[in-house]
């Protein structure tokens, strides 16, 4: 691998204080091209034996200050008929991303790394049946 | 060259229903939100909503909440606003806006669609 | 919700001169404004986003100041093309609102 030097101008990476200084581009690329993200599908909140609805979560002080959160419709799945199978359950599929969260009175602005759990979605799972003793 | 164009103007009876649509190009149509938003004659301009085509995730303005509906059609790159019940006071120019949701603002507007709302 | 109150309603300038622009929110709202130009007829568009940053394309006289509660639009040259109302905007939380507009009218 090729060494690049480091310029003067740059932050010396082995500082202590490196970490406090970085900046950060918040420009957001698409790298998979925009044939792929078109392809994105949106209705299978809808079509799902366990469908959700989406909310937009803001946070003025966060980065992305907009994430769109899945929200299980009903606590059981729903059957070929159209009706709730009392056998399933809807349970919400969470991911862990990481945020910005920027520091309160902080000027100018400086943000520190959070992880948040992120709801993306509904699948439908067999109820635990307990048996009697 | 990103384009944002609306349907012409409406003319509707109170209680009746209209459908506003708005054809985006030049870019990638489930990648941002759409917002819409009102402009009454000589008046300021009020959110109604927002809808994100990649997703189909929808948000309301309270007051636009029962009367209000977005909608996204992907494959011919069109967002809806139907708006239902209609009384005088909703006549106003209705325009569509795309929001970038990381950047955080409106860049490209719609034309308008002029909405009366007569008996 | 959010209220943007502009001043003034109406503002009388010369061309050439400077003109500002006032836009007050009803609480903090960080630097979460955009500031806008309408022509009659026309759709609103985009000039300062993030309270001072120019948006591409728009004439470097147009500048934004401004955060927490209290934000200014200052037009330092006045062209022609530049009588129009002008619309401060708040993303910062949803309903996102605007300012009823100050109208720039030749003097």
């Known amino acids: 691998a090729a060494i690049i030097p480091q310029s003067s101008a740059c932050p010396n990476t082995e500082a202590k204080d490196f970490l406090q200084n970085v900046k950060v581009n918040l420009k957001v690329f698409n790298s998979l091209g925009a044939k792929v993200s078109s392809r994105r599908p949106s209705d299978y909140l809808n079509r799902s034996t366990s469908p959700w609805t989406l909310h937009r979560n803001e946070d003025p002080d966060r980065y992305p200050s907009v994430i769109w959160e899945a929200q299980c419709r009903h606590q059981r799945c729903v059957n070929a008929e159209g009706k709730l199978d009392h056998h399933m359950n809807s349970v919400l599929i969470q991911q862990e991303i990481l945020v910005l969260k920027r520091e309160p009175e902080s000027c100018p602005f400086t943000f520190r790394v959070e992880k948040m759990l992120v709801g993306v979605g509904c699948t439908c799972v067999a109820s635990i049946v307990r048996q009697a003793a | 060259e990103v384009q944002l164009v609306q349907s012409g103007a409406e003319v509707k009876k109170p209680g009746a229903s209209v459908k506003v649509s708005c054809k985006a190009s030049?870019?990638?149509?489930?990648?941002?939100?759409f917002h819409w938003v009102r402009q009454a004659p000589g008046q300021g301009l009020e959110w109604i909503g927002v809808?994100?085509?990649?997703?189909?995730?929808?948000a309301y303005n309270q007051n636009f909440r029962d009367r209000a509906t977005l909608t996204a059609d992907k494959s011919t790159s069109t967002a809806y606003m139907e708006l239902s019940s209609l009384r005088s006071e909703d006549t106003a120019v209705y325009y569509c806006?795309?929001?970038?949701?990381?950047?955080?603002?409106?860049?490209?507007w719609g034309q308008g669609t002029l909405v009366t709302v007569s008996s | 919700e959010i209220v943007m109150t502009q001043s003034p309603a109406t503002l009388s300038v010369s061309p050439g001169e400077r003109a500002t622009l006032s836009c007050k929110a009803s609480?903090?709202?960080?630097?979460?404004v955009g500031w806008f130009q309408q022509k009659p007829g026309q759709s609103p568009r985009l000039l300062i986003y993030?309270?001072?940053n120019r948006y591409t394309g728009v004439p470097a006289r147009f500048s934004g100041s401004g955060s927490g509660t209290d934000f200014t639009l200052t037009i330092s040259s006045l062209q022609p093309e530049d009588f129009a109302v002008y619309f401060c905007?708040?993303?910062?939380?949803?309903?996102?609102?605007f300012g009823q507009g100050t109208k720039l009218e030749i003097k």
């Open positions: 030049g870019y990638t149509f489930t990648d941002y939100e």
């Open positions: 993030h309270a001072s």
């Open positions: 905007q708040q993303d910062y939380s949803s309903p996102y609102t």
């Open positions: 609480q903090s709202v960080s630097i979460d």
């Open positions: 809808i994100h085509p990649g997703n189909g995730g929808t």
């Open positions: 806006t795309r929001f970038l949701t990381y950047e955080g603002y409106f860049d490209y």
